[in-house]
């Protein structure tokens, strides 16, 4: 039975040209994490494998940095970066947990962080 929950940074906004940290946290489970994937829509941005560490997808390596922790830092943001991002936790024995973050990249300097929320 999957008892865990993923807490994410929720709906967030950031300025064009700036950077943003995408964070997820898996709690309320003793399951062991074998790998965390970060995806934007259907594109894999990066993985963090429990054994072998971080691997940034070649097409994103200039604008994506690993961490902090199991989070992901997006740099040199453009308006095209607006959209949904997913953290996918592969665990055993529970299986897969997915968290969703919506990022809006703004032209102006009025970027504010949204509230945190949980996905069961």
């Amino acid at each position: 039975m999957m008892t865990g929950t993923i807490e994410t940074t929720g709906n967030i906004s950031a300025e064009k040209g700036g950077s943003i940290i995408l964070q997820c946290h898996l709690s309320s489970t003793t399951a062991q994490v074998t790998q965390v994937n970060w995806e934007q829509q259907d594109q894999l941005l990066a993985i963090c494998n429990a054994d072998l560490g971080w691997h940034i997808s070649p097409s994103f390596k200039d604008r994506v940095a690993p961490g902090p922790g199991l989070g992901l830092t997006l740099q040199s943001l453009t308006v095209n970066d607006t959209g949904e991002y997913f953290c996918i936790y592969h665990t055993y024995p529970d299986g897969t947990y997915t968290g969703r973050i919506f990022l809006e990249v703004l032209e102006s300097s009025v970027a504010e962080h949204g509230a945190r929320f949980q996905i069961p």
């Epitope: 062991q32 790998q35 994937n37 054994d51 560490g53 691997h55 592969h90 665990t91």
Partner: antibody, heavy 125, light 106 residues
């Protein structure tokens, strides 16, 4: 086609070291991890560890920690496994193997679809 | 480490027989279980990954099932080329293999 070609058989004295090579071809070397498995004569398969050909990170079986080093040379698409302080019970066929899934598949890794032909290492005084 | 126990350690069967090999993990590994076939003097060959996914090029007479701690490899109709040793392997860190099951001709 996709293949892994290993170096030839070795005979070593107890206490010596051995370095086995594994040359990959037919695929993008840095997109897949390489694992090492050994098999003593008449025995089963033993997981030794694996290495990311992308970032060089390694993870070794606990019983071999301190004696084994796995490395890669991306310029030649070659993986290496060095085992030190050899003992008679290290006599085995050593295999390198490529993971079924690339890092960019997003799948959890750990099953091996392409294997080298094996390298027999004999440790004897 | 997670221990993998295979049974039986050996079995005798005839061409056309249905053969079942089991693998039990000492703790739950979800579906992180792979099956290999090995013939004497050869490297192992991947048959099944993620408990039930058939590897490309492997005949459909091979199938895998199970999750958690109990897993099964089934050969629906044994062929002459299937006489070999079969190993399960769990892919939860740190990875380990079962002790093997030798399938011999009756």
């Amino acid at each position: 086609q996709v293949q892994l070609v290993q170096s030839g058989a070795e005979v070593k004295k107890p206490g010596a070291s051995v370095k086995v090579s594994c040359k990959a071809s037919g695929y993008t070397f840095t997109s897949y991890p390489i694992g090492w498995v050994r098999q003593a004569p008449g025995q089963g398969l033993e997981w030794m560890g694996w290495i990311s050909s992308y970032n060089g990170n390694t993870n070794y079986a606990q019983k071999l920690q301190g004696r084994v080093t796995m490395t890669t040379d991306t310029s030649t698409s070659t993986a290496y496994m060095e085992l030190r302080s050899l003992r008679s019970d290290d006599t085995a066929v050593y295999y390198c193997a490529r993971d079924l899934k690339s890092f960019w598949s997003g799948d959890v890794l750990g099953a091996f679809d392409i294997w080298g032909q094996g390298t027999m290492v004999t440790v004897s005084s | 480490d997670i221990q993998m126990t295979q049974s039986p350690s050996s079995l005798s069967a005839s061409v056309g027989d249905r053969v079942t090999i089991t693998c039990r993990a000492s703790q739950s590994i979800s579906s992180y279980l792979n099956w290999y076939q090995q013939k004497p003097g050869k490297a192992p060959k991947l048959l099944i990954y993620a408990a039930s996914s058939l590897q490309s090029g492997v005949p459909s007479r091979f199938s895998g099932s199970g999750s958690g701690t109990d897993f099964t490899l089934t050969i629906s109709s044994l062929q002459p080329e299937d006489f070999a040793t079969y190993y399960c392997q769990q892919s939860v860190p740190p990875r380990t293999f079962g002790g093997g099951t030798k399938v011999e001709i009756k």
